[in-house]
């Protein structure tokens, strides 16, 4: 048993039929010694008396909010949560496996630049009775500080007959140098509590591997005289690391017809302009990627040809 | 990234072209190692990230762009210098700071070159003949070192008398390639920055 936060405890249980469970001793936080009684989840049934209560925790029926009272007055509470381990594996019932980039991916994280700021998100089909808390550090043996905000519900989506809820959190490395070469990964730990169930999820990554620039900005077309060609120009996104001559981007320019089946013309360039042929009803899109370290491409920025 | 990209103008800052070739070569070599050594721990998640130049060179700090010298987090590790303008020792106006940066890059290349050559000698003794270092990568290291045009004492190639442990050698190769790729990225960024200055 360990303390998750004040008056909230997690009991780790091997989860199999007729498992012996864990013996837990609860102590009433009071100077009183006599006349103390214990109840579970505000039911009227008295579980025991005395300053301590010893319980055998085997299943969810044994978890919940234990309260000690004296003469009708509440003295203290202890909330017991269960963390299930089945066949040696901790349960992952609360979050949805996003399966990207590989199976058992529950947390996904992205950074728009090398400033040490990143966003992580996760999915669940659970709508209420759900709390998350997020901690992060650089390295685990001698951890360096990363500060995370509160997890918030960032999107709701309907998937077939079911609703899916996306939660996200923003974190910032306390002392990050954008030019640094990372040798220790960032560790992100999410504690998830659904009713009486506790689970934890972790992700480990280097900022350089989760970089996804914002799309190029100010995408413009300039027709070239007496030609079907146009000059496409754009700028680095505002959120990208500076100086741009050090943190350089490379770009992919795509001409796409109205029909998805039409052949796409693609050009790759390190410059912030390109000359392409603009077909009728087509659109021109540009996306960006770190020039030297191939992490994710940005989303497309697009303009119509007409 | 095997994609059509416009090649730089040959009249540009001389080292930029070499550094781009270096990054391409080490990335290709790392990809080849990952594929060939698929049953070895060779991915970024599996290996220990070691830097053989740690406490010997200070490339990141010595080559820090001027704009980042205001960031205290970039200055906290060592007495730091930063690069100003110049070109790859092609101009007499090369500043002292820049010379420090480029000599640090040169020392990195020399240390990796020695390590890779020693390792290749061991890999050539492997009866499985599973993997060898790409001669192109070694040649590109050499070319960039020549372009940097520093004279420094030659580091003797390490020779070992004991029987090589090929498993350990292959894991060390992965560690070395990952670290060298990260350093090659830094070198490329530095050269791009200098070229724009």
């Amino acid at each position: 048993i360990w303390e998750l936060k004040k008056d909230v405890y997690v009991v780790e249980l091997d989860w199999y039929p007729d498992a012996p469970g864990e013996m837990v001793v609860l102590t009433c936080d009071t100077p009183e010694e006599d006349g103390i009684t214990w109840t579970l989840d505000q039911s009227s049934e008295v579980l025991g008396s005395g300053k301590t209560l010893t319980i055998q925790v085997k299943e969810f029926g044994d978890a919940g909010q234990y309260t000690c009272h004296k003469g009708g007055e509440v003295l203290s509470h202890s909330l017991l949560l269960l963390h299930k381990k089945e066949d040696g594996i901790w349960s992952t019932d609360i979050l949805k496996d996003q399966k990207e980039p590989k199976n058992k991916t529950f947390l996904r994280c992205e950074a728009k630049n090398y400033s040490g700021r990143f966003t992580c998100w996760w999915l669940t089909t659970i709508s209420t009775d759900l709390t998350f808390s997020v901690k992060s550090s650089r390295g685990s043996s001698d951890p360096q500080g990363v500060t995370c905000g509160a997890a918030t519900l960032s999107a709701e989506r309907v998937r077939g007959d079911n609703k899916e809820y996306e939660y996200s959190v923003e974190c910032q490395e306390d002392s990050a140098c954008p030019a640094a070469e990372e040798s220790l990964p960032i560790e992100v730990m999410v504690d998830a509590v659904h009713k009486l169930k506790y689970e934890n999820y972790t992700s480990s990554f280097f900022i350089r591997d989760i970089i996804k620039p914002d799309p190029p900005k100010n995408l413009q077309l300039k027709p070239l005289k007496n030609s079907r060609q146009v000059e496409v120009s754009w700028e680095y996104p505002d959120t990208w690391s500076t100086p741009h001559s050090y943190f350089s981007l490379t770009f992919c320019v795509q001409v796409q017809g109205k029909s998805k089946r039409e052949k796409k013309d693609r050009v790759f360039t390190d410059k912030t302009s390109a000359t392409v042929i603009c077909r009728k009803n087509a659109s021109i899109s540009v996306r960006a990627q770190d020039r030297y370290y191939s992490s994710s491409w940005s989303e497309w920025a697009s303009v119509p040809c007409s | 990234r095997n994609l059509p990209v416009a090649t730089p103008d040959p009249g540009m800052f001389p080292c930029l072209h070499h550094s781009q070739n270096l990054l391409r070569a080490v990335s290709n070599m790392l990809q080849k190692a990952r594929q060939t050594l698929e049953f070895y721990p060779c991915t970024s998640e599996e290996i220990d990230h070691e830097d053989i130049t740690k406490d010997k060179t200070s490339t990141v700090e010595a080559c820090l762009p001027l704009e980042l010298t205001k960031n205290e987090s970039c200055l906290n590790s060592r007495e730091t210098s930063f690069i100003t303008n110049g070109s790859c020792l092609a101009s007499r106006k090369t500043s002292f700071m820049m010379a420090l940066c480029l000599s640090s890059i040169y020392e990195d290349l020399k240390m990796y070159q020695v390590e890779f050559k020693t390792m290749n000698a061991k890999l050539l003794m492997d009866p499985k003949r599973q993997i060898f270092l790409d001669q192109n990568m070694l040649a590109v290291i050499d070319e960039l070192m020549q372009a940097l045009n520093f004279n420094s004492e030659t580091v003797p190639q390490k020779s070992s008398l004991e029987e090589p442990d090929f498993y350990k050698t292959k894991i060390k190769l992965c560690i070395l390639l990952h670290a060298f790729r990260i350093r090659a990225v830094t070198i490329d960024r530095v050269m791009s920055y200098l070229n724009a200055s």
Partner: antibody, heavy 117, light 107 residues
Framework: EVQLVQSGAEVKKPGASVKVSCKAS????????IEWVRQAPGQGLEWMGG????????NYNEKFKGRVTMTTDTSTSTAYMELRSLRSDDTAVYYC??????????WGQGTTVTVSS | EIVMTQSPATLSVSPGERATLSCKAS??????VAWYQQKPGQAPRLLIY???NRYTGIPARFSGSGSGTEFTLTISSLQSEDFAVYYC?????????FGGGTKVEIK
């Protein structure tokens, strides 16, 4: 002892509104959700929504969104469910129940609402 | 929306016999399932929560099992007071949903 006591039966005309109350006692009111469940004559149970004063959250069944409002008054430990634009198929017994970790463990006695012109 | 399907709709059992009631969820609800008993003119009464935990004061002859999408309520030896309608309900994801009910009647 935990108790949920509901207001008395109501007869309403179509288009009218009804407000059912549920007075809780014997536990810390703000620690639990109050859920509302209805049962049409001879039919099964249908969940309408819930309100948690502790977290200030409401959780409505989409079917009733826009027609139902659930509130609480902590000073009297009373929960309310108002259903507007009543139709004849809203004729049912309306139950309140408390819920936290263990399902809906205590229920009110039910309030019969009849909608008839 | 998660649909809870109960079977059979009616179960005719003699007193003293075992009754097995089934409940299937249209998607996984982990073990967030409760079972209720309802007698005519009364409010439902909680029997089982978290799929297999007997609520305070519920006799040991009632037991629940299952997880994911398939759940079972078993009454090991039916007593006369057990003849009633039984509902399963998921509170894993909103909207909470009840099964259509299984009426256990005297054979």
């Amino acid at each position: 002892e935990v108790q949920l006591v509901q207001s008395g039966a109501e007869v309403k005309k179509p288009g009218a509104s009804v407000k059912v109350s549920c007075k809780a006692s014997g536990y810390t009111f703000t620690d639990y959700w109050i859920e509302w469940v209805r049962q049409a004559p001879g039919q099964g149970l249908e969940w309408m929504g819930g309100f948690s004063h502790g977290s200030g959250s409401t959780n409505y069944n989409e079917k009733f969104k826009g027609r139902v409002t659930m509130t609480t008054d902590t000073s009297t430990s009373t929960a309310y469910m108002e259903l507007r634009s009543l139709r004849s198929d809203d004729t049912a017994v309306y139950y309140c129940a408390r819920r936290r970790f263990r399902g809906m463990d205590y229920w009110g006695q039910g309030t019969t609402v009849t909608v008839s012109s | 929306e998660i649909v809870m399907t109960q079977s059979p709709a009616t179960l005719s059992v003699s007193p003293g016999e075992r009754a097995t009631l089934s409940c299937k969820a249209s998607q996984s609800v982990s073990n967030d399932v409760a079972w209720y008993q309802q007698k005519p003119g009364q409010a439902p009464r909680l029997l089982i929560y978290y799929a297999s935990n007997r609520y305070t004061g519920i006799p040991a002859r009632f037991s629940g099992s299952g997880s994911g999408t398939e759940f079972t309520l078993t009454i090991s030896s039916l007593q006369s007071e057990d003849f009633a309608v039984y509902y399963c309900q998921q509170d894993y994801s909103s909207p909470w949903s009840f099964g259509g009910g299984t009426k256990v009647e005297i054979k």
